[in-house]
């Protein structure tokens, strides 16, 4: 969490951002909130990116002002116009690119004063894994698949029954480049699994950590997946 304060001139206002991560090819949110103003026409929001000459986005007098927007963000940004009045300056970024990673500044001017806060934005690819029994294999085998990851993640298997066991000798993980030549499909196979056990396939890179669980008995097979973004620090 980054909390910034304004400095000279008018009074300072508190601006808060949260470090976040964007999933390549999908839409992302750069979070920023500020002390609200009662009059929309008095609020100016500027988004800037370190190393980029033009603005990322500007909102003033109740509407977008994109005359000085940098080419790399053209047609890809939007604020939540109806939420600006309540102090939400978050930016929606469409079709996140790898090159969108970097340090952003959320700069706010209101009738109360000025303020800004920086935000670290990471980009990559992350997706939910699914674990299934592989009946095509010649031994008791689980297959964990996740369609899109970048940078290349690590994959670790764990078991509820054999807690602390190292499954690296009985698993095999492969990474297959997707058609856009950036992200990769992750496939990990775990051999010699046993009935009445719960197995977890954990995929992690510096952006996200995802887990796919499967519980197998003779009367039920339960699957569960969850994904967590790493380093979501507020400023």
């Amino acid at each position: 969490l980054i909390i910034g304060f304004g400095i000279s001139g008018r009074h300072s206002i508190t601006v808060t951002t949260v470090a976040s991560a964007g999933n390549i090819g999908e839409d992302g949110i750069l979070s920023c909130t500020f002390e609200p103003d009662i009059k929309l026409s008095d609020i100016v929001i500027q988004w800037l990116k370190e190393g980029v000459l033009g603005l990322v986005h500007e909102f003033k007098e109740g509407k977008d002002e994109l005359s000085e927007q940098d080419e790399m963000f053209r047609g890809r940004t939007a604020v939540f116009a109806d939420q600006v009045i309540v102090g939400n300056a978050s930016l929606r970024l469409k079709n996140v690119q790898l090159t969108d990673a970097g340090t952003y500044k959320c700069y706010i001017i209101t009738s109360k004063g000025k303020g800004n806060a920086n935000l670290e934005y990471k980009t990559g690819a992350f997706s939910m894994p699914e674990v299934n029994v592989d009946y095509n294999a010649s031994s008791e085998t689980l297959r964990c698949e996740a369609p899109r990851w970048f940078p290349q993640p690590t994959v670790v298997w764990a078991s509820q029954v054999d807690q602390g066991a190292n499954f690296s000798e009985v698993s095999n993980t492969s990474f297959e480049l997707n058609s856009e030549n950036v992200t990769m499909k992750v496939v990990s196979v775990l051999y010699n699994v046993t009935i009445n056990n719960t197995y977890s396939c954990m995929i992690e890179n510096d952006i996200a950590k995802a887990t796919g669980d499967i519980k197998v008995t003779e009367s039920e097979i339960k699957r569960r997946s969850h994904l967590q973004l790493l380093n979501s620090k507020a400023s």
């Epitope: 009946y135 010649s138 031994s139 008791e140 008995t217 003779e218 009367s219 039920e220 097979i221």
Partner: antibody, heavy 119, light 108 residues
């Protein structure tokens, strides 16, 4: 406890069609591959077809390929076998069977339904 | 297709005696073998999977052994309720999943 109950069997003329059903209970049907196995009178067991838990894959014995269609309705916990272009050699008791948790042995069987193909 | 061959076709045994049933695969199936028992007018019942693991509720007198191509089902002391037909089945390679022709265990 696991229960599989087949229905839909009967006498049918060669070349005609019949649809078998198998109602499942006592386990999470939507999570398991399901099979049909048949047994001609006085003969041994013959595997017929399997469908994956999510109906994304089906496999058939060569003897029924192109004539039989296995399907499932996970919202109804029911397995089906649509049998077309029936022949005298298809006369048998048809069992539905639940695949094992990790491999395809047959952990549970229904009581069977008799299909007789005769003119 | 993997062909499963059972022998003998019929086995005559007295109650209380030991019965040994054989099953051979046409190629290696590792331990991917199941044994089933079927009584007249009933559905088959799983006895053994993984060549040697007893299914739930199966008495200890039933045991399975073997791997690769040669497998054995042993009934240590035959009870009256054990007289039935026994089938082996491979699940190493499919389709198709294949059964042996069966061994009928009858009272001597």
């Amino acid at each position: 406890q696991v229960q599989l109950v087949e229905s839909g069997g009967g006498v049918v003329q060669p070349g005609r069609s019949l649809r078998l059903s198998c109602a499942a209970s006592g386990f999470t049907f939507r999570s398991f591959g399901m099979h049909w196995v048949r047994q001609a009178p006085g003969k041994g067991l013959e595997w017929v077809a399997v469908i994956s838990y999510d109906a994304s894959n089906e496999y058939y014995a060569d003897s029924v390929k192109g004539r039989f269609i296995i399907s499932r309705d996970n919202s109804k916990d029911t397995l089906y076998l649509q049998m077309n272009s029936l022949r005298a050699g298809d006369t048998a008791v048809y069992y539905c069977a639940k695949g094992g948790g990790l491999r395809w042995y047959f952990a549970y069987w229904g009581q069977g339904t008799l299909v007789t193909v005769s003119s | 297709e993997i062909v499963m061959t059972q022998s003998p076709a019929t086995l005559s045994v007295s109650p209380g005696e030991r019965a040994t049933l054989s099953c051979r695969a046409s190629q290696s199936i590792s331990s991917n073998l199941g044994w089933y028992q079927q009584k007249p007018g009933q559905a088959p019942r799983l006895l053994i999977y993984g060549a040697s693991t007893r299914a739930t509720g199966i008495p200890a007198r039933f045991s399975g052994s073997g791997s690769g191509t040669e497998f054995t089902l042993t009934i240590s002391s035959l009870q009256s309720e054990d007289f039935a037909v026994y089938y082996c089945q491979q699940y190493q390679s499919w389709p198709p999943l294949t059964f042996g022709g069966g061994t009928k265990v009858e009272i001597k």
